[in-house]
């Protein structure tokens, strides 16, 4: 027969989540209002479709991105669904209490909206490193750790280093992917004899997984500009990022050749690398000044992206237990890392050029920041990852890893796994 | 021509509320950030509070927070200053300014810069009783 | 917070001499730095930005250097119209607010 949601996990998912969700409503009741003094209808859709841009990234783009393996698809993209609206909620306010709360209610508007979905984002990208060895229970305390962890990062970074919203959000791409890879660390690792099949990749779940590429392709200048202060900077990010990602996709499809003896392309280094260009230019996108730059940056961040699909998996799978289709962790990583590495390369051309210690000092602020980010994201992902291990939360056992059907209902299957 | 005209101004007793409107005409509206800033008689320049280009991002001094909202609307070419529960200090003539993000480059690099490049020619308001 | 302090508070120069005017910021604001006139029942008038660049229309004699904590502002000849009010003005990344200095006043010797 098929195998149920084990009974533990009957009783504690839904109590647990309905008592968070009740208690968020209650927060909501009396800590928040909305913006009452918004006049400009109009501006306020134009404003929305920025949002807008992101949810889509976010639901479908990195709800489809995770769903490729062959007996994990519905979970993964359905459990990025219940992420990210839970993660939203608990940003908008986290976000309201760190930065507005002494002026008594914490006031939503369209830019909290935006700023939440971006911190949920995080938790999106982070998951894909433990997707298939956990349940819903244990993914809404990953969700509530690291979005505060990350809501807590952004606070302290501007304030001590006085960096805007775009400057600090930007810290994402190397804090959720360090983030997700500590948690994986933390983690059962070995997969049992009889379930290597399940987190291998299939044709069609591989489509569904290229489709939610496509959508954060398309929508990735939307991301990198969407918390600049000028529409000036916001073109400028939007163009530099289109540049970088079209290139990435050139190199990944034409790397990927290139690293097969066959000459073959590889979906998985594909899936992945089309984005390169995107995470590797978000720190500066708005600062280069011409497409020239930003392409290069692109052919750079995709060439890494396919060199590090080819080489890194065994060593993931081996160390953290990632499967090799879960790219997504040690890319970021690494794509996160070369954005911060060329804002800063920024800071010592202008250092050179100026001869100015006071920009000597930003390069070491920036350093500052950078290591920050990535030791809140490992500290905070162990703690995750310890309180994962916690038997409260039923995890699944490992020789139910990567499977649909520890967790859905088909009517038509007769048979079990 | 680019111009900024405010109105609103006036006579007001302590506690009391007034609002401030600010009429733009001569460039695109909706593209950029908006300031309100103040100067007390005989004093210099105190920054009040800024609006973003659309609406979505608002900051005060600390001087008026809770007491004072920024708001626009672009379909008007309107900026406004909500200000409530006045207070003596507030005595000031009361400037709309454009911020403009200019921004010059090196080869490998842009730097942006703010500043308000377009003033009114300000709205006196008197608080008193 | 950062806080701007400019010197000398007057500053008594004949015309056709050369005015330096100071602005020192109590932390870094790199380059992002303006500088303002103000005539008597005026409004403000944009002169410099990034420190050291003139705003459109700005006469060549007004020049802008400095970055950092340190900026000055130099009138390399006055005319009678550049006695006014001066003030310095910083922008600030987080939060994303406005600074003035408190103003020096370009008097005719």
């Known amino acids: 027969m098929s195998s149920k949601y084990p009974r533990s996990v009957r009783r504690c998912l839904p109590l647990w989540a309905l008592t968070l969700e009740a208690a968020l409503i209650l927060l909501f009741y009396f800590f928040t209002h909305y913006d009452a003094s918004l006049e400009d209808q109009k501006g306020l859709v134009a404003s929305y479709q920025v949002g807008q841009d992101l949810t889509v990234m976010a639901a479908i783009g990195l709800g489809f991105l995770t769903s490729s393996f062959r007996r994990h698809s519905w979970s993964s993209v359905a459990f990025n669904l219940f992420m990210l609206a839970l993660g939203v909620q608990w940003a908008i306010l986290l976000d309201g209490f760190l930065s507005q709360f002494p002026s008594g209610k914490v006031v939503i508007t369209l830019f909290s909206i935006r700023l939440a979905t971006m911190s949920a984002l995080s938790v999106l990208i982070s998951v894909d490193a433990v997707l298939g060895k956990v349940n819903l229970a244990q993914l809404v305390v990953m969700v509530l750790v690291e979005v505060t962890a990350l809501g807590n990062l952004r606070m302290v970074i501007s304030n001590i280093f006085n960096t805007d919203y775009h400057m600090n959000m930007m810290h994402i791409y190397v804090f959720a992917a360090y983030f997700g890879l500590s948690v994986a660390w933390c983690l059962p690792k070995p997969l049992p004899e009889g379930t290597e099949d399940k987190d291998q990749t299939a044709t069609i779940p591989s489509l569904s997984a290229m489709l939610g590429a496509l959508f954060l392709w398309m929508f990735w200048p939307s991301f990198n500009s969407a918390l600049l202060r000028s529409p000036i900077e916001r073109k400028n990010a939007v163009f530099n990022t289109y540049y970088a990602v079209a290139v990435s996709v050139v190199t990944a499809i034409s790397g990927s050749s290139l690293a097969h003896p066959q000459g073959k392309i590889s979906k998985t280094y594909v899936h992945s690398a089309v984005l390169a260009g995107g995470v590797a230019v978000g720190t500066s996108c708005h600062l280069i000044p011409s497409p020239w730059l930003a392409m290069v940056l692109g052919l750079v961040a995709g060439l890494i992206s396919v060199g590090g699909a080819k080489y890194l998996p065994g060593c993931c799978n081996r160390v953290l237990g990632i499967p090799h289709s879960s790219i997504m962790g040690y890319n970021f990583s690494l794509l996160g890392l070369l954005g911060e590495i060329i804002y800063i390369v920024l800071l010592v051309l202008d250092t050179v050029g100026a001869g100015n210690g006071m920009i000597g000092f930003q390069v070491l602020l920036s350093i500052g920041e950078l290591s920050l980010a990535i030791v809140i994201a490992l500290m905070s992902g162990l703690l995750t990852g310890l309180l994962l291990n916690l038997k409260i939360w039923k995890a699944p056992h490992e020789a139910k890893y990567f499977d649909d059907q520890v967790f859905w209902k088909f009517p038509h299957l007769a048979v079990g796994f | 021509q680019v111009q900024l005209v405010e109105s609103g101004g006036g006579v007001v007793q302590p506690g009391r509320s007034l609002r401030l409107s600010c009429a733009a005409s001569g460039f695109t509206f909706s593209s950029y950030a908006m300031h309100w800033v103040r100067q007390a008689p005989g004093k210099g320049l105190e920054w009040v509070a800024v609006?973003?280009?659309?609406?979505?991002?608002?900051y005060y001094a600390d001087s008026v927070k809770g007491r004072f909202t920024i708001s626009r609307d672009n379909s008007k070419n309107t900026l406004y200053l909500q200000m409530n529960s006045l207070r003596a200090e507030d005595t000031a003539v009361y400037y709309c300014a454009r911020e403009s993000t200019l921004y010059s480059s090196s080869w490998y690099r842009r730097y942006y810069y703010y500043s308000m490049d377009v003033w009114g020619q300000g709205t006196t308001v008197t608080v008193s009783s | 917070e950062i806080v701007l302090t400019q010197s000398p508070a007057t500053l008594s120069v004949s015309p056709g001499e050369r005015a330096t005017l100071s602005c020192r910021a109590s932390q870094s604001v790199t380059s992002n730095l303006a500088w303002y006139q103000q005539k008597p029942g005026q409004a403000p008038r944009l002169l410099i930005y990034g420190a050291s660049t003139r705003a459109t229309g700005v006469p060549a004699r007004f020049s802008g250097s400095g970055s950092g904590t340190e900026f000055s502002l130099t009138i390399s000849s006055l005319q009678s119209e550049d006695f006014a009010v001066y003030y310095c003005q910083q922008y600030n990344n987080w939060p994303p607010i406005f600074t003035f200095g408190p103003g020096t006043k370009l008097d005719i010797k």
């Open positions: 609006i973003s280009y659309d609406g979505s991002n608002k």
